[in-house]
Interface confidence: low
């Protein structure tokens, strides 16, 4: 008996095929018997059974011997043993029928569990494997399930249904709603305005939420929000802010933040948060500000940097185009009775360079001055 | 530093049980898929196990029912349970970590030799 | 499951040559799944290829990949001292995750 594996929604056709090319009569029944369709003279005749109206043949191959049964519109229940008859023999054709649907909205938060749960019909065994956007291949049986979603994982799922040795592939568009970073770091010297930005990593027509920045500012003992804010149709507004720091947002998607000047005060590390309409959980990005103020004071040179810089960063004062003087793995360093001239403050990353800053240190008897 | 330690091989008779553990450090492991790999003497490699970042696991036919991969992320260890161990389980075996944005195994560790014997 | 079949099982050539190592899966694989292993005696595997065609970090460039579907290979442009060890292929389209049975370069 032949087999054939089909999926809920689409048109399967199954072939009948005679000894002589021409037209000649044929039936297709079920497993009970009842008649689906066949042919009287160059005319289609339908049965009552229950796929009266998705049921068809293609007209154009009854000449060749050729005498397909059409249905459209699979169901699960259309799942059952066909029998053509034609020049007084029977084939058997058994159509399984598959549906694979993601149990939730196929637009699903970073961290969220994806479960994938295949439609069968009674008596099948088949096994599931699904391919992600990234190529993990995951394998089940009646459900499937993915805990911990990642950005990788948006696109298209690829699954495979297996039954008596054939196949069915399923294709399921999942979104991972998330920002393009979960984390990043902005480096600026004193006095500097600071721009932050949260690129979303999904586009849909219509987005909705609210949001909020917490900062935890390194020299406070406590984190408070800077800004609430609303999201409507991918336009936002701001609903509250703090007086200080005065934070200003961009009016359209990406989310943009602008911090009129880097302080020391400002500091350390952020969260933003975005809860978007009908969706239970918040997508989150954490920021970081990391402020370098270079200073002297009588015959003492200081660098120093305040917020959350990796261990691995170093510090170094040095007086242009020359060598480092000081160079530490430290928040400060600082040179006592510094020579003239233009001294660069530099933090560093295994050679590279992150943030600088310049300070000319004049001559004794004069007052120094910041470019 | 990257680091991969395996640990916890041996002797054992047939039909026996091991654990292997795979200590990690210098990344951060739960954002990794881990393997298990064999060898035996003057053999080629053989994959043993797959653990994804979502705890999912896959094993060859060879090993299924017997052996269970299993990962404790805020210990940062891989572990390797083999029950009803047999003479041709004997092997080197190594723990490997699976790339980030691609499939191949970057990291080994050094590899721990287990010996089934009677 | 998928075979991955290597040939020659052993290639001796001398420093300076190039050598061509071959690959072959059983089915069609996307070039996606497919790395390449150096290993010297004693030593753990060490990872040379992913994607069929992408060095490492840290691979000289004198290795490269290529292939897709069912054959890849794997070339050394030109054989150092270093070189001489057993090469492995290893696909990840399905579980299980097959390693060819190795390729062994050794000297003349």
């Known amino acids: 008996k032949k087999v054939v594996l089909g999926k809920k929604g689409d048109t399967v056709e199954l072939t009948c095929t005679a000894s002589q090319k021409k037209s000649i009569q044929f039936h297709w029944k079920n497993s009970n018997q009842i008649k689906i369709l066949g042919n009287q003279g160059s005319f289609l005749t339908k049965g009552p059974s229950k796929l009266n109206d998705r049921a068809d043949s293609r007209r154009s191959l009854w000449d060749q011997g050729n005498f397909p049964l059409i249905i459209k519109n699979l169901k699960i229940e259309d799942s059952d043993t066909y029998i053509c008859e034609v020049e007084d023999q029977k084939e058997e054709v058994q159509l399984l029928v598959f549906g694979l649907t993601a149990n939730s909205d196929t637009h699903l938060l970073q961290g969220q569990s994806l479960t994938l749960t295949l439609e069968s019909p009674p008596g099948s065994s088949p096994s599931v494997q699904c391919r992600s956007p990234r190529g993990k291949n995951i394998q089940g049986g009646k459900t499937l399930s993915v805990s911990q979603l990642e950005l990788q994982d948006s696109g298209t799922w690829t699954c495979t249904v297996l039954q008596n040795q054939k196949k069915v592939e399923f294709k399921i568009d999942i979104v991972v709603l998330a920002f393009q970073k979960a984390s990043s770091i902005v480096y600026k010297k004193e006095g500097e305005q600071v721009e932050f930005s949260f690129p979303l990593a999904f586009t849909v027509e219509k987005l909705t939420g609210s949001g909020e920045l917490w900062w935890q500012a390194e020299r406070a003992s406590s984190s408070k929000s800077w800004i609430t804010f609303d999201l409507k149709n991918k336009e936002v507004s701001v609903k509250r802010v703090t007086q200080d720091p005065k934070l200003q947002m961009g009016k359209k998607l990406p989310l943009h933040l602008t911090l009129p000047q880097a302080l020391p005060q400002y500091a350390g590390s952020g969260n933003l948060t975005l809860a978007l309409e009908a969706k239970t959980g918040k997508l989150h990005q954490e920021v970081n500000l990391v402020v370098m103020r270079a200073t002297q004071l009588q015959k003492n040179l200081t660098c120093e940097v305040w917020g959350p810089t990796s261990p691995k960063l170093m510090l170094s004062l040095k007086l242009e185009n020359k060598e480092a003087k000081v160079s530490k793995r430290e928040k400060a360093v600082w040179v006592l009775n510094p020579e003239a001239g233009m001294w660069q403050c530099l933090l560093s990353d295994s050679g590279q360079v992150l943030l600088e800053s310049n300070i000319k240190v004049l001559p004794t008897w004069s007052t120094p001055v910041q470019p | 530093e990257v680091q991969l330690v395996e640990s916890g091989g041996g002797l054992v008779q047939p039909g026996g049980s091991l654990r292997l553990s795979c200590a990690v450090s210098?990344?951060?492991?739960?954002?990794?898929?881990m393997h298990w790999v064999r060898q035996a003497t003057g053999k080629g490699l053989e994959w043993v196990s797959t653990?994804?970042?979502?705890?999912?696991?896959y094993y060859p036919g060879s090993v299924k029912g017997r052996f269970t991969i299993s990962r404790e992320n805020a210990k940062k260890f891989l572990y390797l349970q083999m029950n009803s161990l047999r003479a041709g389980d004997t092997a080197v075996y190594y723990c490997?970590?699976?790339?980030?944005?691609?499939?191949?195994?970057?990291?080994w560790g050094q590899g721990t030799t287990v010996t089934v014997s009677s | 499951e998928i075979v991955l079949t290597q040939s020659p099982g052993t290639l001796s050539l001398s420093p300076g040559e190039r050598a061509t190592l071959s690959c072959r899966a059983s089915?069609?694989?996307?070039?996606?799944?497919l790395a390449w292993y150096q290993q010297k005696p004693g030593q753990a595997p060490r990872l040379l290829i992913y994607?069929?065609?992408s060095r490492a970090t840290g691979i000289p460039d004198r290795f490269s990949g290529s292939g897709s579907g069912t054959d890849f290979t794997l070339t050394i442009s030109r054989l150092e001292p270093e070189d001489f060890a057993v090469y492995y292929c290893?696909?990840?389209?399905?579980?299980?995750?097959?390693f060819g049975p190795g390729t062994k370069v050794d000297i003349k």
């Open positions: 653990i994804g970042t979502a705890g999912d696991t």
């Open positions: 490997a970590r699976g790339g980030y944005y691609y499939y191949g195994m970057d990291v």
């Open positions: 994607g069929a065609s």
């Open positions: 290893q696909q990840y389209g399905s579980s299980p995750f097959t």
């Open positions: 089915q069609s694989i996307s070039s996606t799944y």
């Open positions: 210098g990344f951060t492991f739960s954002s990794y898929d």
